[in-house]
C-alpha cells in the first residue's frame, strides 16, 4: 500500500476580481533532505511558477526531519490562472500530490471588446461591437446611444453586435455590462457622420484648356456641406488609378468649389489630354469620401501660333517656300499646313500641303505677276491655326541655294474650296 | 505499487459506442488525475483527456469534444472513457494512464477495433 | 499545438553502442519527458522533467535539453533495449508526442 502522503498543508482556495493578488500555499514534513515543490494548475507542471521554497530544519542533523514551505504567487489574476492547484513532490521512488485548492475568478463584467471611434456616411447602416465574460455568468449587455439606453433592460436588446441602420448626426455610444456583481461601463464610442460620397460625376462642357464637371451631392446629415475638392490628375502613365489605387500616381490639381452649385470649371489643362477626376464634399465633420476616378479628355484645339521662320523665293516662274512648325502649342495632332499666295491684282490660291514643311511652285505667267506674297497656317483636326503674316517672294540671286522639290503647278482655279469659318482669321494682303 | 488494470478487448460497429475501464490501486486513486491515450496501430500517441477523480472534473483533447465522456467511480477506484459515434478510423489500443505533470503509470491498455 | 518531431525515425544499432535520439519541439518548452514502449506492452517512462531517471531505469539512460532542443542518451546500449522511444510534452495544452524513434538491435 502506498506510503503516507508528507504534505501537512494543502493549497487553501483564492476566489477574485480581476487584477487581485494571491497567495497558494502548502506544507509538507520530510526526513531527510527536503525536495523540490512542483505546483500543477488542472494536472499540468507551472513551469514558469512565481513561487518560493522555505525550509526549516527541526533538528540537528541532516536525516532529521524537515518542515517545507512552498508558497505561490498570483500577481494579477486572470481568467488562465483559474483552476485547479496541487503541490508535487517526488520522494524516493514515490510520487506526491497534495489536496488541490481551487482558483476562481469572481467580479465585474470584464471586457474583451468595447465599440470603437469611426467615421460613417450619413444614413448608411452599420454595425457596433461589444462583448464582456464574468464569471459570474451570466453577462446581459445593454447598448446606450447619447447616453440614453436602447432597450428597457440588460438582456432584452441587442447583444454582441448593435446594427444601427444609419444616423444623421455625430452621435456617442457605450455599452453596459451587468453581472451578479454589478455593472460595468464600457468607452464611448464617437461616431462621427460624414458626408455621403458625391454621385454621377460627369461632365458638362469641354474646352481644350477646361473642362467643366458637375455631381450630385450625397445626404450630409443636419451638417450642410461647406464645398466640394475636386481632383484632376493626368492619366497618360495612370495605370494606378485604372487598377484602383487609392491615391494618384502624382501629385494632383485640386480645386475647391463652393456649395451650391455642385459645378465647376477646371482650367488650366493641357488639351487632347486624357485626365482623371474625382470629387469629395466636406461638411463641418470631414470630407466624405473620394468618387472612383472618372476618366476625361480635353479636346483637341487649333494650334495657337502660325508656322515660324517663313522663307519665299522665287525664280523665274518658280518659287521656293519653306518654313518650320509653329512654336505656339498647338493643342492636338498636327495634321499639316495650308499655303495661300496672291499677287497684287490675281485671285487668292489656297493649297494643302500636308504634313512637308517646304514646296517649290510653279507660277504662271513667267513670274509676270507682281508684288506676290505667301501665308502658312498649321491645322489640327480642330481647324486652322492663324495665318502667319504675308511673307513677300524675293528675287532668286545667284549662288543662293535652290533645293530640288517636285514642283507643285499652279492651278488655274484655286485647288480647294474652303468652308467659311476657315476663312475668318486670314489677314488678306 | 501502484497499479492501472483495464478492462478487455472490444470489437464494435461504426456509430456504436465503447466504454473502457481502468481500476487503480496502491496509490489514493483521488489525489491523482487519470488520463486517456489511444495509439493506432503501427501510429504514436494520442492524449484524449483527462479525468480528476476527488472532484470528477474533466478536460478533453479539442479533437474528442462532444464524443468522449470520461467518469469515475470512486468507491472502486475505477475511471472509465466512454467513446461514442464510432468510426473505423477510432480503431487503436486505449491506454489508461496516471499522471503528475507526465504519464507515471500507464494500464496495459484496450484493444477497440472498429468494424462493419 | 506544439508538434514534436523526433530523429531519427528509425535506428539499427550494435550492443555497447551509444545511441543518441533528439527531440525538435515547435514551440519553446519548460521540460521534455521520455517514454519506452516494447512491442505488445504500455509506454513506460523513462525521463521526467527533462533530466530525471524514472525509478527503477537503468543509469545508462539520461536525458539533457532545452527550449526547443532535448535529447535522450543511451550511453552503452544493451539487447534488452529495443524498443520505440517517444518524446512529449506539458508546456501547454493538449500534451503532445512525438512521433516515436525505433531502435533496432544489430
Known amino acids: 500500500q502506498a506510503e503516507e502522503s508528507p504534505f501537512v498543508g494543502n493549497p487553501g482556495n483564492i476566489t477574485g476580481a480581476r487584477g487581485l493578488t494571491g497567495t497558494l500555499r502548502c506544507q509538507l514534513q520530510v526526513q531527510g533532505e527536503p525536495p523540490e515543490v512542483h505546483w500543477l494548475r488542472d494536472g499540468q507542471i507551472l513551469e514558469l511558477a512565481d513561487s518560493t521554497q522555505t525550509q526549516v530544519p527541526l533538528g540537528e542533523d541532516e536525516q532529521d526531519d524537515w518542515i517545507v514551505v512552498s508558497q505561490l504567487r498570483i500577481t494579477s489574476l486572470q481568467l488562465s490562472d483559474t483552476g485547479q492547484y496541487q503541490c508535487l513532490v517526488f520522494l524516493g521512488h514515490q510520487t506526491f500530490v497534495s489536496q488541490p485548492g481551487y482558483v476562481g475568478l469572481e467580479g465585474l463584467p470584464y471586457f474583451l471588446e468595447e465599440p470603437e471611434d469611426r467615421t460613417v456616411a450619413a444614413n448608411t447602416p452599420f454595425n457596433l461591437s461589444c462583448q464582456a465574460q464574468g464569471p459570474p455568468e451570466p453577462v446581459d449587455l445593454l447598448w446606450l446611444q447619447d447616453a440614453v439606453p436602447l432597450a428597457t433592460a440588460p438582456g432584452h436588446g441587442p447583444q454582441r453586435s448593435l446594427h444601427v441602420p444609419g444616423l444623421n448626426k455625430t452621435s456617442s455610444f457605450s455599452c453596459e455590462a451587468h453581472n451578479a456583481k454589478g455593472v460595468t461601463t464600457s468607452r464611448t464610442a464617437t461616431i462621427t457622420v460624414l458626408p455621403q460620397q458625391p454621385r454621377n460625376l460627369h461632365l458638362v462642357s469641354r474646352q481644350p484648356t477646361e473642362l467643366e464637371v458637375a455631381w450630385t451631392p450625397g445626404l450630409s446629415g443636419i451638417y450642410p456641406l461647406t464645398h466640394c475638392t475636386l481632383q484632376a490628375v493626368l492619366s497618360d502613365d495612370g495605370m494606378g488609378i485604372q487598377a484602383g489605387e487609392p491615391d494618384p500616381p502624382e501629385e494632383p490639381l485640386t480645386s475647391q468649389a463652393s456649395v451650391p452649385p455642385h459645378q465647376l470649371r477646371l482650367g488650366s489643362l493641357h488639351p487632347h489630354t486624357p485626365y482623371h477626376i474625382r470629387v469629395a464634399c466636406t461638411s463641418s465633420q470631414g470630407p466624405s469620401s473620394w468618387t472612383h476616378w472618372l476618366p476625361v479628355e480635353t479636346p483637341e484645339g487649333v494650334p495657337l501660333g502660325p508656322p515660324e521662320n517663313i522663307s519665299a523665293t522665287r525664280n523665274g516662274s518658280q518659287a521656293f517656300v519653306h518654313w518650320q512648325e509653329p512654336r505656339a502649342p498647338l493643342q492636338g495632332t498636327l495634321l499639316g499646313y495650308r499655303l495661300a499666295y496672291q499677287g497684287q491684282d490675281t485671285p487668292e490660291v489656297l493649297m494643302d500641303i500636308g504634313l512637308r514643311q517646304e514646296v517649290t511652285l510653279e507660277l504662271q505667267g513667267d513670274g509676270s505677276v507682281s508684288n506676290l506674297t505667301v501665308c502658312v497656317a498649321a491645322y489640327t483636326a480642330a481647324g486652322d491655326g492663324p495665318w502667319s503674316l504675308p511673307v513677300p517672294l524675293e528675287a532668286w540671286r545667284p549662288g543662293q541655294a535652290q533645293p530640288v522639290h517636285q514642283l507643285v503647278k499652279e492651278p488655274s482655279t484655286p485647288a480647294f474650296s474652303w468652308p467659311h469659318h476657315h476663312h475668318h482669321h486670314h489677314h488678306h494682303h | 505499487q501502484v497499479q492501472l488494470v483495464q478492462s478487455g478487448a472490444e470489437v464494435k460497429k461504426p456509430g456504436a459506442s465503447v466504454k473502457v475501464s481502468c481500476k487503480a490501486s496502491?496509490?489514493?486513486?483521488?489525489?491523482?488525475?487519470i488520463n486517456w491515450v489511444r495509439q493506432a496501430p503501427g501510429q504514436g500517441l494520442e492524449w484524449m483527456g483527462w479525468?480528476?477523480?476527488?472532484?470528477?472534473?474533466?478536460k478533453y483533447n479539442e479533437k474528442f469534444k462532444g464524443r468522449v465522456t470520461m467518469t469515475r467511480d470512486t468507491s472502486i477506484s475505477t475511471a472509465y472513457m466512454e467513446l461514442s459515434r464510432l468510426r473505423s478510423d477510432d480503431t487503436a489500443v486505449y491506454y489508461c494512464?496516471?499522471?503528475?505533470?507526465?504519464?507515471?503509470?500507464w494500464g496495459q491498455g484496450t484493444l477497440v477495433t472498429v468494424s462493419s | 499545438e506544439i508538434v514534436l518531431t523526433q530523429s531519427p525515425d528509425f535506428q539499427s544499432v550494435t550492443p555497447k553502442e551509444k545511441v543518441t535520439i533528439t527531440c525538435s519541439a515547435s514551440?519553446?518548452?519548460?521540460?521534455m519527458y521520455w517514454y519506452q514502449q516494447k512491442p505488445d506492452q504500455s509506454p513506460k517512462l523513462l525521463i521526467y522533467?527533462?533530466?530525471n531517471l524514472a525509478s527503477g531505469v537503468p543509469s545508462r539512460f539520461s536525458g539533457s535539453g532545452s527550449g526547443t532542443d532535448y535529447t535522450l542518451t543511451i550511453n552503452s546500449l544493451e539487447a534488452e533495449d529495443a524498443a520505440t522511444y517517444y518524446c512529449?510534452?506539458?508546456?501547454?495544452?493538449?500534451?503532445?508526442f512525438g512521433q516515436g524513434t525505433k531502435l533496432e538491435i544489430k
Open positions: 479525468i480528476y477523480p476527488g472532484s470528477g472534473n474533466t
Open positions: 512529449q510534452q506539458w508546456s501547454s495544452n493538449p500534451p503532445t
Open positions: 522533467l527533462t533530466s
Open positions: 514551440s519553446s518548452i519548460g521540460y
Open positions: 496502491g496509490y489514493p486513486f483521488t489525489d491523482f488525475y
Open positions: 494512464a496516471r499522471s503528475t505533470g507526465f504519464f507515471d503509470y
